[in-house]
């Protein structure tokens, strides 16, 4: 029971964090108009990884595409690279850990298949997760060593009296979403590899059958002593039942306090 | 037909207050920022302070800050100027004005003529 | 405050003349962002509010006469009458309208020859 809820919370956790890094990607919100110390001006000015937004006290919003690829810093093409790496590996984590659920059931699925495609999935959760926080992080060390430049040349002389202000840009609400989001999609993909451990069965390489001795209460399978004395893995999680001999397939299909539902 | 009607005017006795109305028509009121701007006797405009549709932020020029306080009533489409601490620089025509495309003035009212003096 | 000078005080110009006027900010009005220039001018005829001719330095209010056009980008702003009629006699403000407060210009009036 443990496992399933562990795997399904898992699955959840990076649902809703790669949500958070889709919708982090997509906003525009990721540097805003630093206003503290600053001159108050009449517009708003923020930015995106694919465009920058200018909101007037009018509250018309203008925005404008980078319909540059080439004139464009190498660290938001880093920053946009890591973000898509992370969307595309969680949507594919995502895809694999559905067909991972313990709580669905796909044709004759073994539980070691679904071990692997929890791993799997987790794995890829973590790669996303990490992907995110790294862009992310990215670009806010970007964000902070242009802050702090602008604020050294705050004002520009123009010659004379005049003087044009430098607009600072601070932290803007996507990078918050999307650390958030990366932490997420982490402890998702966490959660499935923790996961995946309870759900690897115990490897076996024949049938067992379950016998109830009237004399003894003895388990007796083929095997020999390893089988008889409790010693074989395959006697871990399997119940032995009243009323003759089960097959291990069989045996597996019921639930017992043992099972994983 | 965008309409603004200033009303409230008259003659105040330095140190007084008086309370500006500005009547608003003929477009969605709630959705749009507004200025009040004066203008001294044979003077130039000066622009006394701004109000943004839901009511902040509202910016005051430094003049007439801490005396002067801009409000609105979307509901009623009535925008307010409540004056203060009256100074005879502060005789003026006062004009509304709707906040527009690059934070211009697009439409004015005809102005309300306030006059301090004892 | 930013500071808004405009030149010259006063102009006197026959009809049909071309005219031009100066508007001069002591900070750039440039915003980044869009590179856009956040200057309007405005006419007043006597006894009348302003009427908003220009915004964004160049774009021309609907309803207004072609003859009138703005340029000019950062500091420096020209308000041009292509044709001067009788009815543009008035006097003419350049304003801030990227930094608060918003200032206006001492305004150039236009007079008849």
């Known amino acids: 029971m443990a496992v399933t809820a562990c795997q399904g919370l898992g699955f959840v956790v990076s649902l809703i964090g790669i949500a958070g890094i889709i919708a982090a990607t997509c906003m525009d919100q990721w540097s805003t108009q630093d206003l503290y110390n600053n001159p108050v001006t009449a517009v708003f000015n923020y930015q995106g990884l694919w465009r920058s937004c200018v909101r007037e006290s009018s509250g018309f919003t203008e925005c404008r595409g980078y319909f540059t690829l080439l004139g464009l810093p190498a660290m938001l093409q880093a920053v946009r690279a890591l973000m898509i790496v992370g969307i595309v590996l969680g949507a594919i984590g995502l895809l694999v850990s559905i067909f991972a659920l313990k709580c669905i059931r796909i044709g004759s699925m073994e539980d070691s298949a679904k071990a692997n495609m929890t791993l799997t999935s987790g794995i890829m959760f973590i790669v996303s997760g990490l992907c995110a926080i790294a862009g992310v992080s990215v670009f806010a060390n970007m964000l902070v060593t242009n802050f702090w430049m602008s604020t050294a040349n705050m004002y520009t002389g123009m010659g004379g009296m005049v003087q044009t202000v430098q607009t600072r840009y601070t932290f803007g609400a996507a990078l918050f979403v999307g650390w958030v989001a990366g932490g997420l999609t982490l402890i998702g993909g966490v959660m499935m590899c923790i996961a995946c451990r309870g759900l690897a069965p115990e490897e076996t390489n024949y049938k067992a059958v379950s016998y109830h001795a009237s004399g003894h209460s003895v388990a007796y399978k083929p095997g020999g002593f390893k089988a008889s004395t409790g010693f074989g893995s395959n006697t871990k999680n399997k119940k032995i039942y009243d009323g003759g001999a089960r097959t291990e397939d069989e045996v597996q299909s019921y639930p017992s306090k043992h099972d994983y539902v | 037909e965008v309409q603004l009607q200033e009303s409230g005017g008259g003659l105040v006795q330095p140190g007084g207050s008086r309370k500006l109305s500005c009547a608003a028509s003929?477009?969605?009121?709630?959705?749009?920022?507004m200025h009040w701007v004066r203008q001294a006797p044979e003077k130039g405009l000066e622009w006394v302070a701004f109000i943004s549709s839901g009511s902040s932020p509202i910016y005051y020029a430094d003049t007439v800050k801490g005396r002067f306080t801009v409000s609105r009533d979307n509901p009623k489409n009535t925008l307010f100027l409540q004056m203060t601490s009256l100074r005879s620089e502060d005789t003026a025509m006062y004009f509304c004005?709707?906040?527009?495309?690059?934070?211009?003035?697009?439409?004015w009212g005809q102005g309300s003529s306030v006059t301090v003096s004892s | 405050d930013i500071m808004m000078t405009q030149s010259p005080l006063s102009l006197t110009v026959t009809a049909g003349e071309k005219v031009t006027m100066n508007c001069k900010s002591s900070?750039?009005?440039?915003?980044?962002?869009?590179?856009?220039?956040?200057l309007a001018w405005y006419q007043q005829k006597p006894g009348q509010p302003p009427k908003l001719l220009i915004y964004?330095?160049?774009t021309r209010e609907s309803g207004v006469p072609a003859r009138f056009t703005g340029s000019g980008s950062g500091t420096d702003f020209t308000l041009t009458i292509n044709t001067v009629q009788a009815e543009d006699l008035a006097v003419y403000y350049c304003?801030?309208?990227?930094?608060?407060?918003?200032?206006f210009g001492t305004g150039t009036k236009l007079e008849l020859k």
């Open positions: 304003q801030n309208d990227y930094f608060y407060p918003l200032t």
């Open positions: 004005a709707r906040n527009y495309y690059g934070n211009a003035m697009d439409y």
């Open positions: 964004w330095a160049s």
């Open positions: 900070q750039s009005l440039l915003n980044g962002g869009n590179q856009k220039n956040y």
């Open positions: 003929g477009f969605s009121f709630s959705s749009f920022g």
